[in-house]
């Protein structure tokens, strides 16, 4: 660092002396009361060929000194007056000091009725004093003088001293406000320091500091520390900053110049929208988080979230951060689409790129329906099994079951239902179901029962009599049977074109009709089977009933 200035002291300690008197100058360095090594003396800029730390002078002018451990002292102006009356001030004098003024006559014994003046006005209570004290002097351009009466033989002659401008030294330097940055970035810390320097000749003086923005006091007001740490600066902290330093006794107060501090707002850049779950693939009912972030940007950032096709924003957040989140609870199918976010901390928002959100919907319970050519399915019919979930994101895989046996599967790539075709056989009767699966969990349909009805085959009519030949009085059994056909089957029995009667068979084995034979029962017999899918006629069987002996009766 720079070596401290040397200090020039006077002995006697008055800056004005009479011509012919001697004044001792002492060069003192702050590090040592007296200088060590060579001391350089200058009188009106001229190097004097004396190297002691103490010199005697008789010539007026500006004196300076410099020691090995210090830099050049401030100039001290010493006056040697040829006048009869001089006003002396103690040297050194600092701002705020109570300074002693002494009115001296060349022949002081014959000088009386001394009066002291400041700027032409008599100082109060200053009449006929050898010395007076002027309280708390400042560095103004006040001029002091004194008057006195000089005895000249028997006369008293009034004499006036030359005006004295007291060399008041600064007790401490005018403060300078230093900021760690004059254009801090919003959100960054800043240190303000109220810099001053106390005169090394007055190390015991205690100073206090206060810092201001515009007219507002910062921190806790007066403090013994010249430093104030502001943890984070915001745009509203921009303004005119200054500081004050004063002695703790309030005798001297000094104010720094104002420093304009503009808090710089870093415009937002690189706005990014991120969606959780990552990738923007959601299942209906899940929660979605839209995270809007900026790579750079300071201060208060307004984030907003937008969806394509929606005029109003989904939400807005204003906060001092580089990231904000918007929570969308239990997403619905309608939440699918393209999203972007915007961030703004200056004048116009910066937009992120679009991000697509897909909301996948689990399949609902599918509904199984039969599509057939007729209400009652018949063997040979083409049956279409149609399975459909009314909700669910494609692709949906449908599986078809008959009595828990997988018949097959069919995919619906773009939604809707799927069909499976069967050419019906009698075995296809039973319970059918389907399930739907789009990867978000399979759902089962209710079971649907199918009855495949079989048309009756051509019945066979057989006549059963006790003997080989039908004889009057025999009990004849007409038996009609279709070997195929869904029950119930209604069997009709005919003699010639007369209906003998009908019998319903609810299970296999056909149906029988009994006749007690008479001769009139001879003739052609037939039967018919009908289960509602079309009647089938048997072949005609001829019966010959004989009225004589049993062994002559025959069947053809």
């Amino acid at each position: 660092g720079v070596a401290p200035k040397a200090v020039l002291l006077l002995n006697p300690p008055w800056s004005t002396a009479f011509k012919g008197e001697k004044v001792a100058l002492i060069c003192s360095s702050i590090s040592h009361s007296l200088a060590q090594g060579d001391t350089y003396w200058y009188h009106d800029e001229k190097l004097l060929k004396i190297k002691h730390d103490k010199i005697q002078i008789t010539e007026p002018g500006n004196y300076q000194c410099k020691t090995r451990g210090s830099s050049l002292s401030d100039a001290v102006h010493v006056e040697f007056s040829p006048d009869w009356l001089i006003l002396q001030a103690l040297h050194p004098v600092f701002e705020g000091d109570n300074v002693i003024l002494r009115c001296q006559g060349k022949d002081n014994k014959n000088t009386h009725q001394k009066v002291y003046y400041k700027d032409g006005k008599q100082l109060p209570n200053s009449y006929n004093l050898e010395k007076i004290t002027v309280n708390s002097v400042s560095r103004d351009n006040s001029k002091y003088h004194c008057t006195a009466y000089r005895k000249f033989y028997i006369l008293d002659i009034e004499v006036t001293s030359k005006p004295l401008n007291i060399q008041v030294q600064e007790l401490f330097l005018h403060p300078v406000l230093r900021a760690s940055s004059s254009t801090p970035i919003e959100g960054s810390p800043m240190t303000l320091t109220c810099e001053t320097q106390l005169s090394p000749q007055r190390p015991d003086v205690q100073l206090q500091f206060s810092l201001f923005r515009d007219s507002q006091t910062l921190g806790l007001g007066w403090s013994r520390s010249p430093r104030l740490q502001i943890p984070a600066m915001w745009t509203e902290d921009s303004g005119s900053y200054w500081c004050e330093v004063e002695t703790v006794t309030h005798s001297i107060k000094k104010r720094s110049l104002r420093s304009q501090i503009r808090v710089q707002r870093v415009p937002v850049s690189n706005v990014n929208l991120e969606i959780r779950p990552t990738g923007g693939q959601l299942i209906e009912g899940e929660n979605m988080v839209l995270i809007c972030s900026v790579a750079q940007g300071s201060g208060t950032v307004t984030f907003s979230w937008h969806k394509e096709g929606r005029v109003r924003s989904l939400g807005r957040k204003t906060q001092r951060s580089l990231l904000a989140e918007l929570h969308v609870l239990t997403v619905k199918e309608s939440d699918a689409g393209r999203y972007y976010c915007a961030a703004d901390n200056v004048h116009s928002p910066i937009l992120s790129t679009w991000i697509r959100v897909t909301v996948r919907i689990p399949v609902s319970h599918p509904v199984l329906t039969f599509r057939a050519p007729r209400a009652h399915t018949v063997v040979g019919d083409l049956l279409e099994l149609h399975c459909e979930s009314l909700r669910g994101s494609p692709p949906i895989l449908y599986r078809f079951y008959h009595e828990d046996v997988t018949l097959g599967n069919s995919s619906a790539p773009s939604g809707g239902g799927a069909s499976f075709n069967l050419s019906l056989t009698a075995e296809h009767s039973g319970n059918y179901s389907c399930d739907a699966d789009n990867g978000l969990g399979a759902q089962h349909s209710h079971g649907v029962s199918l009855r495949v009805t079989v048309p009756v085959s051509r019945p066979v009519l057989t006549l059963r009599a006790p003997g080989a030949q039908a004889v009057v009085g025999d009990l004849l059994e007409l038996h009609c049977e279709s070997l195929r056909g869904s029950f119930p089957i209604l069997y009709w029995f005919y003699h010639e074109d007369d209906t003998l009667g009908n019998i319903s068979a609810h299970s296999g084995g056909g149906a029988s009709f009994n006749l007690s034979l008479t001769t009139e029962h001879s003739g052609n017999y037939s039967c018919e089977a009908d289960n509602g899918l079309g009647a089938q006629h048997s072949k005609v069987v001829t019966l010959n009933v004989t009225g004589t002996s049993r062994n002559r009766t025959g069947l053809t």
Partner: antibody
Framework: EVQLQQSGPELVKSGASVKMSCKAS????????MKWVKQSHGKSLEWIGD????????FYNQKLKGKATLTVDKSSNTVFMQLNSLTSEDSAVYYC?????????WGQGTTLTVSS | DIQMTQSPATLSVTPGDSVSLSCRAS??????LHWYQQKSHESPRLLIK???QSISGIPSRFSGSGSGTDFTLSINSVETEDFGMYFC??????????FGGGTKLELK
């Protein structure tokens, strides 16, 4: 009468060095500091450095980072300033001046032109 | 570093006018402030030392005042020979001296 006589104008190439002089008369040479000042065309004044002819002690403007070197020849009451690694920025009038705190007497100036 | 700021940059006056030139230091420099005059194609000339001390050979119409950070050079009744550039210089942090940017005093 105090007089400071400076050497004549210099035209030098970029990258070269130059040494100019200032001869003092009319006072005791070793009693007063000598200063050097630069004045670019139409601009203000910039202090370069001080030399104490009594003991050769030098002080330089910290901003100029070794651009100048000041020397003294007591036998001829002359101070010298050498400027090195010259660029067009060094084209200016250079004054020597006597004084400790202020610049009481000035030389007539030396014009330096640096050509590329 | 101590910066010295002079104002105004240019001052247009008529002979006979009285003018004040300002010099402001970036920090307190006590009375360690000196004023110079430089006429066209001439070397500068010392006018005032230590803010207010006069220099022998300089006309009494030139006077200086101020202390700390604000200083003034006053010319009482400008004469035609006074036109030119005026510079202030601080010597507070010896030996690092700095000059102000200058004020041009010109004929109106």
């Amino acid at each position: 009468e105090v007089q400071l006589q400076q050497s004549g104008p210099e035209l030098v190439k970029s990258g070269a060095s130059v040494k100019m002089s200032c001869k003092a008369s009319g006072y005791t040479f070793t009693d007063y500091y000598m200063k050097w000042v630069k004045q670019s065309h139409g601009k203000s004044l910039e202090w370069i450095g001080d030399i104490n002819p009594y003991n050769g002690e030098t002080f330089y403007n910290q901003k100029l980072k070794g651009k100048a070197t000041l020397t003294v020849d007591k036998s001829s009451n002359t101070v010298f300033m050498q400027l090195n690694s010259l660029t067009s920025e060094d084209s200016a009038v250079y004054y020597c001046a006597r004084g400790l705190y202020f610049f009481a007497y000035w030389g007539q100036g030396t014009t330096l032109t640096v050509s590329s | 570093d101590i910066q010295m700021t002079q104002s105004p940059a240019t001052l247009s006056v008529t002979p006979g006018d009285s003018v004040s030139l300002s010099c402001r230091a970036s920090q307190s420099i006590s009375n360690n402030l000196h004023w110079y005059q430089q006429k066209s194609h001439e070397s500068p000339r010392l006018l005032i030392k230590f803010a207010s001390q006069s220099i022998s050979g300089i006309p009494s119409r030139f006077s200086g005042s101020g202390s700390g950070t604000d200083f003034t050079l006053s010319i009482n009744s400008v004469e035609t020979e006074d036109f030119g550039m005026y510079f202030c210089q601080q010597s507070n942090n010896w030996p690092q001296y700095t000059f102000g940017g200058g004020t041009k005093l010109e004929l109106k």
